[in-house]
Interface confidence: low
């Protein structure tokens, strides 16, 4: 399906509003430090050019690829070398190497200030004064902080952001209306970004076979009534969509995502009974709804898997004829029967099955060799079931904050070389699994928990890749995507680690502690906890609990004092001395 002008084709397919939004997202994800006004100027120039191509597809440069057009535009930025250093060298390359070069310079942890939320009246005034600029600023700020955010989904978030302001800026109590909506968008946005980052890591680090396997398992769970051929078609299309978005081809990605939504809605009968309510919605909402749709009911009469995959004498013949198709069918059949399993567990089972066939189909008596293959699955299934059970019990016993602290200690002991901010961020997010998953019924706990943990651990992996400090982390992150979580779970105290020297400065606190929000106070305390463990990796739970209780008491006391700063100056050294003694 070739077009004389790719840019005209995408402009016509997407419409001006979505075209401009996606180009802004693309540019903001590539040049994360550029000021907003610079990006708006570039987007306007590209849009005007696209319109000339719509009017005449034969016009000069209209036949160029989108990568060429966008790359040329990015390379006109005057301050490229001062702002981005070696990324400026990308501009000396030809496509497709230039785009690959830009992709490699995307920064998962850009040095950008945290977004501060202004007063509600200030935001409402800005929204009413210039709605278009206000929404563009939202796209820009999110995209530059989350360079792999799923672009068509970000347009959906922007639409919800707009709706929140349109509704709440009219309300009697603007803040009561708006703030919960903004909190929800922020939390959902962070989760969406992290989930997409795992998809991109899967594609970029492990290839499209890994992503396709993930998609077969997940879509088979969602659509257990769909036949294998239907699931395979959806997987192929979904892989194309995510490959494009992860590769920076945001216009193609959004266009193909819309086509996929259209196809699914036109073929509901052969996919799932749950799609109906999604398909009545407008495009952005429809695509989001389809992505989040609940699992359809399992067919009642599914036969045992053993007949085709263990008892049959044709297993090796069928495997040899088309390995990936046969394994794909196995994964489909297993996943559609197991909405209660995490996708990662299903992929481990498929891997184990593949390994057994590779070994047994070369043996003297293949059938005898693979007859007990399903028994080998048992420990693989028991391990995450038990992990979820134990951690949910711990969460219920401790509550979220103390559960996060338990994980902070656990992970700092495993990988003490990792930076303290990363350990705090990752452990806090790991700890959120409790509130997210432990309240669910048994059958939903494992898929919720393990697949969420995979997303959080991927964040650890992408941050660690930027500045590698631990061979253990590198090993767990790179050896096997599906075994990342078990690999981290299996890590023990790092005996080779040389404890960090005690630095009193790390444990010096000031009166500004008292004005922090509850969340910021927790982060401060958790930062101190990580530093304590790095200083004394063999400290017992009881010792650490004692120090943390003393810390909380010391902060509380000084925050109640008349002269807070004087209290911190006087009590701080006492706290440090007592802590050192307690940990000696």
């Amino acid at each position: 399906d070739t077009h004389k002008s790719e840019v005209a084709h995408r402009f016509k397919d997407l419409g001006e509003e979505h075209f401009k939004g996606l180009v802004l997202v693309a540019f903001s994800q590539y040049l994360q430090q550029c000021p907003f006004e610079e990006h708006v100027k570039l987007v306007n120039e590209v849009t005007e050019f696209a319109k000339t191509c719509v009017a005449d597809e034969s016009a000069e440069n209209c036949d160029k690829s989108l990568h060429t057009l966008f790359g040329d535009k990015l390379c006109t930025v005057a301050t490229l070398r001062e702002t981005y250093g070696e990324m400026a060298d990308c501009c000396a390359k030809q496509e497709p190497e230039r785009n690959e070069c830009f992709l490699q310079h995307k920064d998962d942890n850009p040095n950008l200030p945290p977004l501060v939320r202004p007063e509600v009246d200030v935001m409402c005034t800005a929204f009413h004064d210039n709605e278009a600029t206000f929404l563009k600023k939202y796209l820009y700020e999110v995209a530059r902080r989350h360079p792999y955010f799923y672009a068509p989904e970000l347009l959906f978030f922007a639409a919800r952001y707009k709706a929140a302001f349109a509704e709440c800026c009219q309300a009697a109590d603007k803040a009561a209306c708006l703030l919960p909506k903004l909190d929800e968008l922020r939390d959902e946005g962070k989760a969406s970004s992290a989930k997409q980052r795992l998809k991109c890591a899967s594609l970029q680090k492990f290839g499209d076979r890994a992503f396709k396997a993930w998609a077969v398992a997940r879509l088979s769970q969602k659509f257990p009534k769909a036949e294998f051929a239907e699931v395979s078609k959806l997987v192929t299309d979904l892989t194309k969509v995510h490959t494009e978005c992860c590769h920076g081809d945001l216009l193609e990605c959004a266009d193909d995502r819309a086509d996929l939504a259209k196809y699914m809605c036109e073929n509901q009968d052969s996919i799932s009974s749950k799609l109906k309510e999604c398909c009545d919605k407008p495009l952005l909402e429809k695509s989001h709804c389809l992505a989040e749709v609940e699992n359809d009911e399992m067919p009642a009469d599914l036969p045992s898997l053993a007949a085709d995959y263990v008892e049959s004498k044709d297993v090796c013949k069928n495997y040899a004829e088309a390995k990936d198709v046969f394994l794909g069918m196995f994964l489909y059949e297993y996943a559609r029967r197991h909405p209660d399993y995490s996708v990662m567990l299903l992929l481990r089972l498929a891997k184990a099955y593949e390994a057994t066939l590779e070994k047994c189909c070369a043996a003297a008596d293949p059938h005898e060799c693979y007859a007990k293959v399903f028994d080998e699955f048992q420990p693989l299934v028991e391990e995450p079931q038990n992990l979820v059970k134990q951690n949910c019990e711990l969460f219920e016993q401790l509550g979220e904050y103390k559960f996060q602290n338990a994980l902070l200690v656990r992970y700092t002991k495993k990988v003490p070389q990792v930076s303290t901010p990363t350990l705090v961020e990752v452990s806090r997010n790991l700890g959120k699994v409790g509130a997210k998953c432990c309240k669910l019924p048994e059958a939903k706990r494992m898929p919720c928990a393990e697949d969420y943990l995979s997303v959080v651990l991927n964040r650890l992996c992408v941050l660690h890749e930027k500045t590698p400090v631990s061979e253990k982390v590198t090993k767990c992150c790179t050896e096997s995507l599906v075994n990342r979580r078990p690999c981290f779970s299996a890590l023990e105290l790092d005996e080779a680690y040389v404890p960090k020297a005690f630095n009193a400065e790390t444990f010096t606190f000031h009166a500004d502690m008292c004005t922090l929000s509850e969340k910021e106070k927790q982060v401060k305390k958790q930062t101190a906890l990580v530093e304590l463990v790095k200083h004394k990796p063999k400290a017992t739970k009881e010792q650490l609990k004692g120090v943390m209780d003393n810390f909380a008491a010391f902060v509380e006391k000084c925050c109640k004092a008349d002269d807070k700063e004087a209290c911190f100056a006087e009590e701080g050294p006492k706290f440090v001395a007592a802590s050192q003694a307690a940990l000696a």
């Epitope: 209660d340 028994d375 048992q378 299934v381 028991e382 079931q385 059970k389 048994e442």
Partner: nanobody
């Protein structure tokens, strides 16, 4: 022949106790996750409890947690369910079933007993 045979059901008053037994033949219970599943009159199957092959992992449905205890005697190749503080809503046919791969889904259990009736009534 591979089979399971339950016993121990009967009529009991609310608050009372019963111990169900399930004798296995043709295979060893310690090689499989074993389950108790029940079916109340006119209702669907409800999974009650499971014990993994290693015996390390034991699970209960929320409706019976704290009242029922699953156990296994490898020497006797048998599975048990100790039921205390029985309630009227525990009235059902109780089946023991073999789960070939700890799947936890009754529709994938491959070997079932014929069931034993438990009636809780005053």
């Amino acid at each position: 022949e591979v089979q399971l045979l339950e016993s121990g059901g009967g009529l009991v008053k609310p608050g009372g106790s019963l111990r169900l037994s399930c004798a296995a033949s043709g295979f060893t219970v310690s090689s499989y996750t074993m389950n108790w599943v029940r079916q109340a009159p006119g209702k669907g199957l409800e999974w009650v409890s499971s014990i993994s092959s290693s015996g390390r992992y034991i699970y209960y449905a929320d409706s019976v947690k704290g009242r029922f205890t699953i156990s296994r005697d490898n020497a006797k190749n048998s599975l048990y369910l100790q039921m205390n503080s029985l309630r009227a809503e525990d009235t059902a046919v109780y089946y023991c079933a073999r789960d070939p791969r700890m799947v936890g889904n009754p529709h994938e259990f491959d070997i079932w007993g014929q069931g034993t009736m438990v009636t809780v009534s005053s």
